[in-house]
Interface confidence: low
């Protein structure tokens, strides 16, 4: 329904607080280097303008699109050319090209300082002194570091962030109350950002059809009692929400997400029996809860799939009449029967089914041709099952840190051209699959593990896309969204790689390592491990283990020494020499 003023419409729907927060997120996600104060000034100007439009929708410029209004505002930033270089050229374009140009310049790995957490008392003082600025700063810092963060979900995180400070800053022991909550928000936030990044990559790189297929499979697993028509409606609405958020249309996205939550709760009887608790919550909590809700129980009397999709004489007729609807029905029926499969596996099965029908419906005897299509699914199902079994056994044997190291070695050998920080970050996250998923029973392991790996490998893909260095990574990332993990799994050692020149500086350590947290110390050691493999890609597990054990002993010894720096200098030289000898460098 057309509104005379889009900005007035969204302001009224969302309310001033959410409107301002979402505009701040949008601006920070576009201009990631701009100072906080500059963004706040821009947001206040937009908000004041929106209020004039609420008062009189016919007022000057109130009829302009949100992209035009926001883009014009962003293009008033004085230092655009100095700070952002060629992004300033976007301002010479007209909408919608200008917005597309801004989107293309979003940086998944912006050159921003690490967020350092101040002392609890300092944070509590800042919170009490100016709560509004404190919370805006949280939105700004997260949004600029995560330019695809799901904006309405970030409002939910901000609400929890505020609640944590409200509760803990008046607690007897502020730190004991606050720090675990902040750690939890940080970890959940990183996971939420990565999950949303995959949704946006899916839409932007593989198109709406790919996203809709993912949504059909996931919603059918979650709501197996819902009719196909109901699932299709939810998929259409969900696709609109995510298309908007991934496209920078955050006000529309948040508004439509609220409408979708309202619809789901009003129709929960025909969707799922698990929604009752979610639907009693306030809006932000409700939307989050629905997104995370557990799978409903499968209907007891589901018939065999073969009747409609293999045995029926009408398979090719039904397929020809409405290909995507028929394939959607297949995916829905398969997914609702298989909460134990990963979404990507279900999509591989649907793709195999589609390929078979394309071939067979043009054959002399179609039925004879596709009669055995379900037999083709067996190896596709067994491959992730076996992989997860092997890796969970390895994880249980090694523990998380050493399991991460095994993956670091594995992936560095596969794609040694990738930057060391990216290999460390991605392999550490791949390794977390163990603690996240291996504890689950068999029926929950695959959806947990393989769908999580899809999220992590997407991080590799988006980081690599910024500075492509490996044809193998590009190939696995771009050929097929659902086959990314099997593609990376299938990569062997890159025999074409020319080992990196040995540089002693890379393996020089100082006393500052002793004061690092356990996590940061692990990252230092894992960085050294990646560099070792890049120097000696043919090194055996045993050789690498020996060098890493020596390295751990060296760090422990020098951190206990009275003169740490001298110890690191002298013992470090010996360690480098010994390692070179051990690895034949």
């Amino acid at each position: 329904d057309a509104h005379k003023s889009e900005v007035a419409h969204r302001f009224k729907d969302l309310g001033e607080e959410n409107f301002k927060a979402l505009v701040l997120i949008a601006f920070a996600q576009y201009l990631q280097q701009c100072p906080f104060e500059d963004h706040v000034k821009l947001v206040n100007e937009v908000t004041e303008f929106a209020k004039t439009c609420v008062a009189d929708e016919s007022a000057e410029n109130c009829d302009k699109s949100l992209h035009t209004l926001f883009g014009d505002k962003l293009c008033t930033v004085a230092t655009l050319r100095e700070t952002y270089g060629e992004m300033a050229d976007c301002c010479a374009k007209q909408e919608p090209e200008r917005n597309e140009c801004f989107l293309q310049h979003k940086d998944d790995n912006p050159n921003l300082p690490r967020l350092v957490r101040p002392e609890v008392d300092v944070m509590c003082t800042a919170f009490h002194d100016n709560e509004e600025t404190f919370l805006k700063k949280y939105l700004y810092e997260i949004a600029r570091r995560h330019p695809y963060f799901y904006a309405p979900e970030l409002l939910f995180f901000a609400k929890r962030y505020k609640a944590a400070f409200t509760e803990c800053c008046q607690a007897a022991d502020k730190a004991a109350c606050l720090l675990p909550k902040l750690d939890e928000l940080r970890d959940e936030g990183k996971a939420s950002s990565a999950k949303q990044r995959l949704k946006c990559a899916s839409l932007q790189k593989f198109g709406e059809r790919a996203f809709k297929a993912w949504a059909v499979a996931r919603l059918s697993q979650r709501f197996p009692k819902a009719e196909f028509a109901e699932v299709s409606k939810l998929v259409t609405d969900l696709t609109k929400v995510h298309t908007e958020c991934c496209h920078g249309d955050l006000l529309e996205c948040a508004d439509d997400r609220a409408d979708l939550a309202k619809y789901i709760c009003e129709n929960q009887d025909s969707i799922s029996s698990k929604l009752k608790e979610c639907c009693e919550k306030p809006l932000l909590e409700k939307s989050h809860c629905i997104a995370e809700v557990e799978n409903d129980e499968m209907p007891a009397d589901l018939p065999s799939l073969a009747a409609d999709f293999v045995e029926s004489k009408d398979v090719c007729k039904n397929y020809a009449e409405a290909k995507d609807v028929f394939l959607g029905m297949f995916l829905y029926e398969y997914a609702r029967r298989h909460p134990d499969y990963s979404v990507v596996l279900l999509l591989r099965l649907a793709k195999t089914y589609e390929t078979t029908l394309e071939k067979c419906c043009a054959a002399a005897d179609p039925h004879e041709c596709y009669a055995k299509v379900f037999d083709e699914f067996k190896p596709l199902v067994e491959e992730p099952q076996n992989l997860i079994k092997q890796n969970c056994e390895l994880f249980e044997q090694l523990g998380e840190y050493k399991f991460q190291n095994a993956l670091l070695v594995r992936y560095t050998k596969k794609v040694p051209q990738v930057s060391t920080p990216t290999l460390v970050e991605v392999s550490r996250n791949l390794g977390k699959v163990g603690s996240k998923c291996c504890k689950h029973p068999e029926a929950k392991r695959m959806p947990c593990a393989e769908d999580y790996l899809s999220v992590v490998l997407n991080q590799l893909c988006v980081l690599h896309e910024k500075t492509p260095v490996s044809d193998r990574v590009t190939k696995c990332c771009t050929e097929s969204l659902v086959n990314r993990r099997p593609c990376f799994s299938a990569l062997e050692v890159d025999e074409t790689y020319v080992p990196k020149e040995f540089n002693a500086e890379t393996f020089t350590f100082h006393a500052d390592i002793c004061t690092l947290s356990e996590k940061e110390r692990q990252i230092k050691k894992q960085t050294a491990l990646v560099e070792l493999v890049k120097h000696k890609p043919k090194a055996t597990k045993e050789q690498l283990k020996a060098v890493m054990d020596d390295f751990a002993a060296f760090v422990e010894k020098c951190c206990k020494a009275d003169d740490k720096e001298t110890c690191f200098a002298e013992e470090g030289k010996k360690l480098v020499a010994a390692s070179q000898a051990a690895l034949g460098l």
Partner: nanobody, 115 residues
Framework: QVQLQESGGGLVQPGGSLTLSCAAS????????MSWVRQAPGKGPEWVSA????????RYADSVKGRFTISRDNAKKTLYLQMNSLKPEDTAVYYC????????GSQGTQVTVSS
Amino acid sequence: QVQLQESGGGLVQPGGSLTLSCAASGFTFGSFGMSWVRQAPGKGPEWVSAIDSSGADTRYADSVKGRFTISRDNAKKTLYLQMNSLKPEDTAVYYCTIGRSTSRGSQGTQVTVSS
């Protein structure tokens, strides 16, 4: 290298007492507030008590108030927890931490309260 070494745990009957010690090294002990944290089997870490750097300000979780006493000896770089009127629900691994954190930096000492 920062090190915290707890001792003094053991098996004790309900109503009994124990004193836990935490020997610190590798940092300026007298400049930091310290805490005792415990972790019961199958549960997350629970903050028990805290003391400021001078020993003047002490805080306790409601579950141990009036039964436990935290203290410190900066000269000996040692933190203490005197536990009286012990209950079965006090059974846990106890560990000391720098500041008021609930993240484990040490092995801890097992306290079991059982008849």
